[in-house]
């Protein structure tokens, strides 16, 4: 006996899809070798039309594809518009056609409906509308109109000329008479549901001359579109509901238990708390179009989803829907990475953010996650040279360690740092990553003076006090600018007298500006790092002025001024609208920008739900106000 | 309140036939998948046959053990599910159920993935 299982028979229809599983067991050697699906000929053999490695027949090219879900031990052919042709017998199968390890399955494809039997044949999906159409001759222009529904072996009023209508359609139904000129009437039903399915008779007059013709109704549930991502990756649902429903609540809920559909977002701002920090729904087209991208995805991620529009921001009968079945991928290709970063009030964090190795030019982003409405997250810094300019002398984007990984490190940390935030490029989308960072009480490692003033032509000599724990790690100081932080030489001062408890491995680095110039003013960091993994630092602003008294300036760390909470923008900075530049493969269903590089004083856009908005300066300009 | 009744048991001789009939009502939505599963005295529910419905597709699956002997068939607008079974054998001896699941998520001879069930109707088949 094979141990494939699958379908023994399936029945559709011309024009119809089928969506064939065929399952397999999940041993290693299973899970990845070659999956196909091929029609068995007259003779005995088994010609491939699909299979996993790539290829596809000529038959099925551009209506069918082959998916493989290696952790739940199963491969999904589908194949779109069927024809009668495509009647016949098939094998799903593992490794090599002529094998055993395959499973028959028999296709049959029936002709499309049509005009049977006088009977016009309406398919129509769910929570959409459907226009019966209902002939009827000259004498009965001026006689009751009127639709019928067989329930059993009687026929109920659904609608008629007179004004009635059915309880069970009420305010989602209507009958017209068109001019005098055409000999027709139409019945129009809205927000289609399931039990709308079924025979319908429409009749023009009562007696026996009456105008009678008989429809059937076919509402149909979508079937759901299979989405296979990886573990940690991210999912973006398109939403297309047509322009009808542009101005009514949408929703994306996952299915549970039965027909219940938990609401994972709606544009009515609720949101499932599993989703908080890793969930943005983008704002909707004119035609009601409308995305959801979800990040950090989870095994319990999986599922069925729907999303649809209704009054209530909620699934109901008569919503339009689309469906998607989420698998996520357990051997995924994105690393595990922290999804919880904790750092200390003061201090700072070193976020790690994967990205797709293959892509190592792409430009490289980190954002602010925002909850407000429908979710929306503020670009902070990319890899080309552009911090938001709240984050001046705080933030940096490094390329290292490179090869699949990025940093950002963020100091001056303060209790409004903490949330979520998203690691992303222009490249793959589905290599956006999420962390949350969290603030916990403590001291900061790093022991440096507050804000620094240093002479013009002077030298300055700024301390960083390492203790003990950074022993093995080296030590650096660095120029901040938005392009990163250049190293400095600094000297190594011995140990150092700042800590209590900590012995002769602590150390003094101090930072040396000799002849000091204006263009030595601005933020500088110390830090820790092992190899391109970078640990704590802490930063220290200095201004440069006019000569007052003649020598050289030693800071310690009591001299020091107190670091001001925040820099605030000159009276003259110009905050402009955010005039986003679409880059088509920078989130296609995002609001995000490309490139602002010309705006002079430009802000940086978002991924976003909302329209323009006023995001910050860019510190391409610098301005600081001490 | 969702019921699943099932008809149609009873003694059969070794070779013999029987047709058992599965009516659900208050089913929510449009079923997706209705199946059939035996039970033996002592033993697990074990999956014997199904068919899954999406839009005006239908996927029909067997057991091995009864492949070429039994068939089902089904209404889904009528919410009807029938197993007709043929060349009956003394293990096919069992407490027959039907379930029914309003999606077609999971294999579909796993029980766990059916949310409703039936009573059962009892298959004797012995001379």
């Known amino acids: 006996k094979s141990p494939i299982f699958g379908p023994e028979e399936v029945n559709s229809v011309e024009g119809n899809s089928v969506s064939i599983t065929c399952y397999y067991p999940p041993t290693s050697v299973n899970r990845h070798t070659r999956k196909y699906w091929c029609r068995q000929g007259a003779r005995g053999g088994c010609i491939t039309l699909i299979s996993s490695e790539g290829y596809v027949s000529s038959k099925y090219a551009g209506r069918a594809n082959l998916t493989n879900f290696p952790e739940n031990g199963t491969f999904v052919v589908n194949i779109a518009q069927l024809s009668q042709d495509d009647s016949g017998r098939y094998k799903c199968g593992l490794g090599i056609n002529s094998r055993g390890l395959s499973f028959d399955v028999s296709l049959e494809v029936s002709q499309g409906p049509g005009l049977l039997n006088d009977t016009k044949v309406y398919t129509v999906d769910l929570g959409r509308t459907v226009t019966i159409n209902c002939p009827f001759k000259t004498e009965n222009a001026q006689k009751r109109k009127s639709l019928y529904k067989q329930i059993g072996l009687y026929p109920v009023l659904v609608i008629d000329s007179s004004g009635y209508v059915n309880p069970n359609y009420t305010g989602r139904i209507r009958l017209d008479i068109q001019g005098t000129g055409q000999l027709l009437f139409s019945v129009v039903i809205n927000q289609l549901r399931l039990s709308d399915a079924g025979q319908y008779l429409c009749q023009a007059g009562d007696d026996s001359n009456s105008n009678k013709k008989n429809a059937d109704l076919q509402v149909l549930k979508p079937e759901p579109e299979l989405v296979y991502e990886d573990l940690r990756g991210s999912v973006t649902f398109h939403c297309a509901l047509g322009p009808e429903v542009a101005n009514v609540a949408k929703f994306l809920c996952r299915q549970s238990s039965g027909e219940n559909c938990d609401v994972v977002v709606n544009t009515l701002g609720k949101r499932a708390p599993a989703f908080e920090g890793r969930i943005l729904l983008n704002p909707q087209d004119k035609d009601g179009s409308f995305s959801v991208v979800i990040t950090g995805l989870r095994k319990e991620d999986a599922g069925r989803y729907l999303c649809g529009a209704h009054s209530d921001g909620q699934l109901q009968e008569g919503s339009p829907i689309q469906a998607w079945q989420l698998f996520v991928n357990e051997e995924s290709t994105i690393p595990r990475s922290p999804t919880v970063v904790k750092g200390v009030a003061g201090s700072s964090v070193a976020v790690l953010c994967p990205y797709n190795r293959k892509e190592s030019k792409s430009i490289k982003y980190w954002c602010l996650w925002e909850g407000a409405q429908n979710g929306r997250c503020p670009l902070l810094v990319d890899s080309e040279g552009w911090v938001k300019a709240q984050y001046e002398g705080r933030l940096s984007l490094l390329e290292e360690p490179g090869n699949g990984t990025f940093t950002v490190i963020l100091n001056q940390l303060t209790s409004r740092d903490a949330g979520f935030y998203w690691c992303l490029t222009n490249g793959d989308t589905l290599w956006r990553t999420t962390v949350e960072i969290k603030i916990i009480e403590g001291e900061p490692n790093l022991k440096v003076p507050g804000n620094v003033t240093a002479v013009l032509g002077e030298t300055l000599k700024v301390p960083c006090h390492f203790p003990c724990k950074f022993s093995s790690y080296e030590k650096y100081w660095c120029k901040w600018n938005n392009t990163g932080c250049q190293a400095l030489p600094s000297q190594d001062e011995g140990p150092s007298k700042a800590f209590v408890n900590c012995d002769e491995n602590s150390r003094l680095v101090s930072l040396t500006l000799n002849l000091v110039t204006r263009a030595d003013e601005g933020w500088y960091w110390c830090g820790v790092k092992q190899g391109h993994f970078y640990g704590e630092t802490a930063a220290v602003y200095v201004a440069v002025e006019e000569r007052k008294a003649a020598g050289s300036r030693d800071v310690s760390l009591a001299k020091a001024d107190a670091a001001p909470d925040e820099k605030v923008l000159d009276s003259g900075f110009r905050e402009i609208e955010n005039k986003a530049i679409q880059d088509p493969r920078l989130f296609a269903e995002e609001k995000a920008v490309a490139d602002t590089r010309d705006q002079a004083d430009g802000s940086r856009a978002s991924v976003d739900s909302g329209s323009s908005e006023e995001q910050g300066g860019s510190s391409r300009h610098h301005h600081h106000h001490h | 309140e969702v019921q699943l009744v099932e008809s149609g048991g009873g003694l059969v001789q070794p070779g013999g036939s029987l047709r058992l009939s599965c009516v659900a009502s208050?089913?929510?939505?449009?079923?997706?998948?209705m199946a059939w599963f035996a039970q033996a005295p002592g033993k697990e529910r074990e999956f014997v046959a199904a068919?899954?419905?999406?839009?005006?597709?239908?996927?029909?699956y067997y057991s091995d053990s009864v492949k070429g002997r039994f068939t089902v068939s089904g209404d889904n607008a009528k919410r009807t599910l029938d197993l007709q079974m043929k060349d009956l054998n003394p293990e096919d001896t069992a407490l027959y159920f039907c379930?029914?699941?309003?999606?077609?998520?999971?294999?579909?001879?796993?029980?766990?993935?059916?949310?409703?069930w039936g009573q059962g109707t009892q298959v004797t088949v012995s001379s």
């Open positions: 208050g089913l929510p939505g449009s079923s997706s998948r």
């Open positions: 379930a029914a699941h309003p999606n077609d998520d999971g294999d579909p001879r796993i029980s766990g993935n059916y949310q409703y």
């Open positions: 068919i899954a419905w999406r839009g005006r597709t239908s996927y029909k």
